[in-house]
Interface confidence: medium
């Protein structure tokens, strides 16, 4: 019985569409598969950043894959030819690796990166990124930041620049139709006439980044002698009511403080008829049903009762 | 509608050089390796030179290797031959083909340019 | 390198006529060979891959066969359009060669 082999994938490649750390992996397939016409011929395919412990593995009959990296770092994959047991008349045949390597080749030094990237998701609405300049760097270093997301042609430049001393120091993005629920790929590049500048890169989804507006129309309604129901509103914007976790704070008579997060825009509160005075506050975040992350909104307005009985008045501010 | 536009051709002394560019539309540029393939006035076809989808692998024929340079701008969708100390036999028709892939098949032409004429004349 | 031998180099028949080209490999390439047609002033089109495969819109009146290193090309039924030359080319491995031609003229 000879021997069944096969090679493996031919001019195996990682390819950078310039979309900011969303990267093709590409191969040909072996010499000789001729022999296999009659079988799916599979390929294994790892790969991972450089310096992370767990490769990514995955199985196709495709001559390509996509996924996300952190251009920060270096890439490494390797494929090997899979033919199945049905193939060989007995137990699975795999080829040697072919393996490939993937960097951006860095610019300047660590420090001269920016420093501090924040990025919030304003109401599920409005975008803004902020950064502080790098490290040392001079003020003719100025800061570009372009973008990308799956939908998009091509990566676009930041338009809008928030500016100190003659700086980009932030990003007010315009509306970006589509882009949740999906990795949203930011690269800030630099120049100066003194020094290379480092270039950054950022990967996460909208969704995980929100910061909702704080809830409306605080009121208080007695439903019974020693309960009070406490009702607010979602506040305007896109997200719907299902999507916010919400956070109260309650004083009472300046002594108690109770602090409690529910999901629904209502609270009922257990008091006495000696209350002579509550506040309370809220603020909302996205919840785990919509997002796996979130910002905590600003408090809302601070809502109080005084000195009535509350059976007989509803609060509206 | 997929298309390969060539351009660069033209009159050149032999020792000179010249640089020819094909534009690519019409489908998933850098996904398909790339080939230039040329025809001498009245002869069969010869291929030249081969870049796969990403530029890392390069593949040239023996009579234009170290003379000629392929290569590709995934950006920009365009595929270039930089022919260099170009001979009277290097006059021909050049065009670019796109390669062919399947599951099971590669290195074919499925695609091809109108073609353009470069000479090598004194 | 790998040689194409093609032959016959030239051909007349006439329209309806059934044609066979054929395509010897110095070496054993598989399946992979390709065929093309070329009419005068134009470039090359792609017919068959992989020795067999008709390249997309193709007409089923074109069909290739064989393994290893001989190869057939056959136009089952002549029409006015195929006049035209027709190369073979293997597709195994660098360097990607081109039989010399067969040029398919009027009777």
């Known amino acids: 019985d000879t021997e069944i082999k096969v090679n493996p994938p031919q001019d195996f490649e990682i390819v950078d569409p310039g979309y900011l750390g969303y990267l093709y992996l590409q191969w040909q397939p072996p010499l000789s598969l001729d022999h296999f016409k009659e079988c799916t011929v599979e390929y294994e395919l790892k790969y991972r950043n450089i310096g992370s412990e767990t490769w990514k593995t995955i199985i196709t009959k495709n001559l390509h894959y996509k996924d996300g990296f952190d251009l920060n770092k270096g890439i490494e994959a390797k494929i090997h030819t899979l033919l199945p047991w049905q193939c060989t008349n007995g137990s699975e045949v795999q080829s040697s690796w072919a393996e490939t390597t993937y960097w951006i080749s860095p610019q300047g030094i660590p420090e001269t990166k920016v420093q501090d990237m924040d990025c919030v998701y304003y109401n599920w609405q409005y975008l803004l990124c902020s950064w502080k300049p790098g490290i040392g760097v001079l003020l003719d270093t100025n800061y570009n930041l372009f973008y990308w997301y799956e939908g998009l042609d091509h990566a676009l430049q930041c338009v809008d620049y928030i500016k100190a001393d003659g700086q980009n120091i932030g990003c007010r993005f315009p509306y970006l139709e589509a882009s949740d629920y999906k990795d949203f790929y930011i690269c800030v590049n630099g120049s100066s006439e003194n020094k290379p500048i480092r270039s950054s890169y950022f990967t996460f989804q909208l969704q995980n980044i929100v910061k909702p507006l704080p809830p409306v129309y605080l009121t208080f309604t007695r439903e019974s002698s020693c309960e009070i129901k406490l009702k607010w509103s979602i506040p305007l914007g896109p997200i719907p009511a299902r999507c916010f976790d919400y956070e109260i704070e309650i004083r009472e008579d300046d002594t108690t403080l109770v602090t409690a997060t529910v999901e629904n825009e209502t609270y009922t509160l257990k008091t006495t008829n000696e209350t002579r005075q509550l506040c309370f506050v809220v603020r909302s975040k996205v919840n785990i049903y919509c997002s796996d992350d979130g910002i905590w909104s600003e408090w809302s307005d601070k809502q109080c009762w005084e000195g009535e009985d509350l059976s007989k008045k509803t609060l509206l501010r | 509608e997929v298309q390969l536009v060539e351009s660069g051709g033209g009159l050149v002394q032999p020792g000179g050089s010249l640089r020819l560019s094909c534009a690519a539309s019409g489908f998933t540029f850098s996904r398909n390796g790339m080939s230039w393939v040329r025809q001498a006035p009245g002869k069969g076809l010869e291929w030249v030179a081969t870049v796969s989808s990403g530029g890392s692998y390069i593949y040239y024929a023996d009579s234009v290797k170290g003379r000629f340079t392929i290569s590709r701008d995934n950006a920009k969708n365009s595929l270039y031959l930089q022919m260099n100390s170009l001979r009277a036999e290097d006059t021909a028709v050049y065009y670019c083909?796109?390669?062919?892939?399947?599951?099971?098949?590669?290195?074919?032409?499925?695609?091809w340019g109108q073609g353009t004429l470069v000479t090598v004349s004194s | 390198d790998i040689q194409m031998t093609q032959s016959p180099s030239s051909l007349s028949a006439s329209v309806g006529d059934r044609v066979t080209i054929t395509c010897k490999a110095s070496?054993?390439?598989?399946?992979?060979v390709a065929w093309y047609q070329q009419i005068p002033g134009k470039a090359p089109k792609l017919l068959i891959y992989s020795a067999s495969y008709r390249s997309t819109g193709v007409p089923d009146r074109f069909s290739g066969s064989g393994s290893g290193t001989d190869f057939s090309f056959i136009i089952s039924s002549l029409q006015p359009e195929d006049f035209a030359t027709y190369y073979c080319q293997h597709h195994y491995s660098a360097p990607w060669t081109f039989g010399g031609g067969t040029k398919v003229e009027i009777k």
């Open positions: 070496q054993d390439v598989g399946t992979a």
């Open positions: 083909a796109r390669q062919g892939t399947t599951a099971l098949a590669t290195r074919f032409f499925d695609v």
